[in-house]
């Protein structure tokens, strides 16, 4: 529906609190380096303007698009060129090019200091002194570090963040109450950010059709009792929501997401029996709950898929009449029968089916040609099954830390040109698949593992895209969204790689390692491991294990020493020499 004033429409729909929060998120995701106070000032100006439009939709500038209003506001920032360089050139453009320009300058790895958590008492004081500013700061800090974070979901995180402080700052043991909650929010937040980053990459790099295919498969698994027409409607609406959020249209996105949640709850009888509890919750919780809801039970007596998609004489006619609808029905029917498959596997099967029909429907005897198409699915299904089985066995044998190390070595050998911090971050996340998914029964392992790996490999792809260094990474990231994981799995040791020059400084450690958390200490060791592999890509597992065991013993010994720094200096030199000898450097 056309509204005289879009900004007034969204302000009224969302309410002032959500409006302000979403504008702050939008601005922080665009101008990631701007100080908090500058953003708050811009948000307040936009909010005041929106209120004038609510009072009189015909007032000056109220008819302008949100992109125009927000872009004009961002372009008033005085230090734009000094802080952002060429991003300032966006301001010379007209909409919609200006917004596209801002989007292209979003930085997945902004040069921002790590968020250090203050003492609990300090945080509680800040929370009590000015709750509103405290929560705005949370939105700002998360949004600028995660420029694709799903904005309506960030509102949900902020609500939980507020609830944690409200409860725990009154508790007898504030820290015991608060810290686990903050850890949980941090971990969930990182996961949520990464999942949304994949959705945006899917839309932006592979187009709406790719995203819709993903959504058909996932929603069909989740809502197997829903009719195809119902799933198609949900997919269309969900695609609109995510297209808006990934495009920076956060007000529209949040508004449309609320409408979608409302529709789902009003029609839950024809969608899923699992929605009842979700639909009793307030809006933000409701939307989150629906997004995470468990798969409904499959309908009994689902007929064979082969009847309509292989045995029918009308396959080519149906395909020719409406290719995407027919393939969508195939994907829907296959996915609702296979909650045990990953979404990416289902998409590979649909792609194989499509390729077969393209070839066979032009053949002399189409039916004879496509009659065995389902046989082609077998190896595609078995490949991830076998891979997950092997890796879960390895995880159970090694435990998470050593499993991560095995992956660090594996991936560094595949793509040694990638920066060490990226290899460490990505391999650590890949390694988390073990504790996340291997505990599940067979029927849940593949969807858990392979779809999680898609999210993690997308992190590698977006980080690599910023500064491309490996043709192999570029190839795996850009050729096919659904074949990224098999593409990386298939990579062998890069024989063209020239080993990195040995630099003793890389392997020089100091007493500060002793005060690090267990996680930070692991990262230090894993960084060293990646560097070792980069120096000696042909090193065997045994050689690397020996060096890493020596390294762990060295850190433990020096952290127990009276004069830690001297120990690190002297024992460190010995360790480097011994390691060089062991690896033949």
């Amino acid at each position: 529906d056309a509204h005289k004033s879009e900004v007034a429409h969204r302000f009224k729909d969302l309410g002032e609190e959500n409006f302000k929060a979403l504008v702050l998120i939008a601005f922080a995701q665009y101008l990631q380096q701007c100080p908090f106070e500058d953003h708050v000032k811009l948000v307040n100006e936009v909010t005041e303007f929106a209120k004038t439009c609510v009072a009189d939709e015909s007032a000056e500038n109220c008819d302008k698009s949100l992109h125009t209003l927000f872009g004009d506001k961002l372009c008033t920032v005085a230090t734009l060129r000094e802080t952002y360089g060429e991003m300032a050139d966006c301001c010379a453009k007209q909409e919609p090019e200006r917004n596209e320009c801002f989007l292209q300058h979003k930085d997945d790895n902004p040069n921002l200091p790590r968020l250090v958590r203050p003492e609990v008492d300090v945080m509680c004081t800040a929370f009590h002194d000015n709750e509103e500013t405290f929560l705005k700061k949370y939105l700002y800090e998360i949004a600028r570090r995660h420029p694709y974070f799903y904005a309506p979901e960030l509102l949900f995180f902020a609500k939980r963040y507020k609830a944690a402080f409200t409860e725990c700052c009154q508790a007898a043991d504030k820290a015991a109450c608060l810290l686990p909650k903050l850890d949980e929010l941090r971990d969930e937040g990182k996961a949520s950010s990464a999942k949304q980053r994949l959705k945006c990459a899917s839309l932006q790099k592979f187009g709406e059709r790719a995203f819709k295919a993903w959504a058909v498969a996932r929603l069909s698994q989740r809502f197997p009792k829903a009719e195809f027409a119902e799933v198609s409607k949900l997919v269309t609406d969900l695609t609109k929501v995510h297209t808006e959020c990934c495009h920076g249209d956060l007000l529209e996105c949040a508004d449309d997401r609320a409408d979608l949640a409302k529709y789902i709850c009003e029609n839950q009888d024809s969608i899923s029996s699992k929605l009842k509890e979700c639909c009793e919750k307030p809006l933000l919780e409701k939307s989150h709950c629906i997004a995470e809801v468990e798969n409904d039970e499959m309908p009994a007596d689902l007929p064979s898929l082969a009847a309509d998609f292989v045995e029918s004489k009308d396959v080519c006619k149906n395909y020719a009449e409406a290719k995407d609808v027919f393939l969508g029905m195939f994907l829907y029917e296959y996915a609702r029968r296979h909650p045990d498959y990953s979404v990416v596997l289902l998409l590979r099967l649909a792609k194989t089916y499509e390729t077969t029909l393209e070839k066979c429907c032009a053949a002399a005897d189409p039916h004879e040609c496509y009659a065995k198409v389902f046989d082609e699915f077998k190896p595609l299904v078995e490949e991830p099954q076998n891979l997950i089985k092997q890796n879960c066995e390895l995880f159970e044998q090694l435990g998470e830390y050593k499993f991560q190390n095995a992956l660090l070595v594996r991936y560094t050998k595949k793509v040694p040109q990638v920066s060490t911090p990226t290899l460490v971050e990505v391999s650590r996340n890949l390694g988390k698949v073990g504790s996340k998914c291997c505990k599940h029964p067979e029927a849940k392992r593949m969807p858990c593992a392979e779809d999680y790996l898609s999210v993690v490999l997308n992190q590698l792809c977006v980080l690599h895209e910023k500064t491309p260094v490996s043709d192999r990474v570029t190839k795996c990231c850009t050729e096919s969204l659904v074949n990224r994981r098999p593409c990386f799995s298939a990579l062998e040791v890069d024989e063209t790689y020239v080993p990195k020059e040995f630099n003793a400084e890389t392997f020089t450690f100091h007493a500060d390692i002793c005060t690090l958390s267990e996680k930070e200490r692991q990262i230090k060791k894993q960084t060293a491991l990646v560097e070792l592999v980069k120096h000696k890509p042909k090193a065997t597992k045994e050689q690397l294990k020996a060096v890493m065991d020596d390294f762990a013993a060295f850190v433990e010994k020096c952290c127990k020493a009276d004069d830690k720094e001297t120990c690190f200096a002297e024992e460190g030199k010995k360790l480097v020499a011994a390691s060089q000898a062991a690896l033949g450097l």
Partner: antibody, heavy 121, light 110 residues
Framework: EVQLVESGGGRVQPGGSLRLSCAAS????????MGWVRQAPGKCLEYIGI???????YYASWAKGRFTISRDNSKNTLYLQMNSLRAEDTATYFC???????????????WGQGTQVTVSS | IQMTQSPSSLSASVGDRVTITCRSS????????LSWYQQKPGQPPKLLIY???DLASGVPSRFSGSGSGTDFTLTISSLQPEDFATYYC???????????FGCGTKLTVL
Amino acid sequence: EVQLVESGGGRVQPGGSLRLSCAASGFSLSSNAMGWVRQAPGKCLEYIGIISVGGFTYYASWAKGRFTISRDNSKNTLYLQMNSLRAEDTATYFCARDRHGGDSSGAFYLWGQGTQVTVSS
Amino acid sequence: IQMTQSPSSLSASVGDRVTITCRSSESVYSNNQLSWYQQKPGQPPKLLIYDASDLASGVPSRFSGSGSGTDFTLTISSLQPEDFATYYCAGGFSSSSDTAFGCGTKLTVL
């Protein structure tokens, strides 16, 4: 007992609409393609269309646009929605189960007894 | 698509061998997607033969079908009293929209 029972027939004025039902018992309606066939008094059998196990519908060219086949798996019932009815649509309407699942083979091995539709003013 | 049955009516006696033919204006699907039905007054049709020559479940072996492409035959080797009825052929074609019935052959007692 495996059977099909049609209902919903009757007298209707030209231009009117009617929805016929076909209740299946003893088997799942969605396990085979299900079709509708009609027979005017003392005339030939005439194929109307079919719905496949996956819900694809196929209609005789003359029926396309006016007639719609659907089913409700939860009720194990097949439907024929008929719009803009004419005098020449007067016939006994049969629902039938095809040997195939995904298309019409023309081999209907289970039939209902039929329901009479009369279109007249 | 036209299905032409001949003859349109036929008289015969118990014990006779009877042949009914069906011709389609186009080849049926796979050259064999043709069925034969028997219908008695006030009853729905009953499937006798499918895929041109396969006997439907519970149908006596005196009924047989043959043919391919556009020309098909239903044979009753030795007429029984209960066989006097109208016989229809039906063809399946390359599209499910094109399924068609013949207009029947009425078999009566001579």
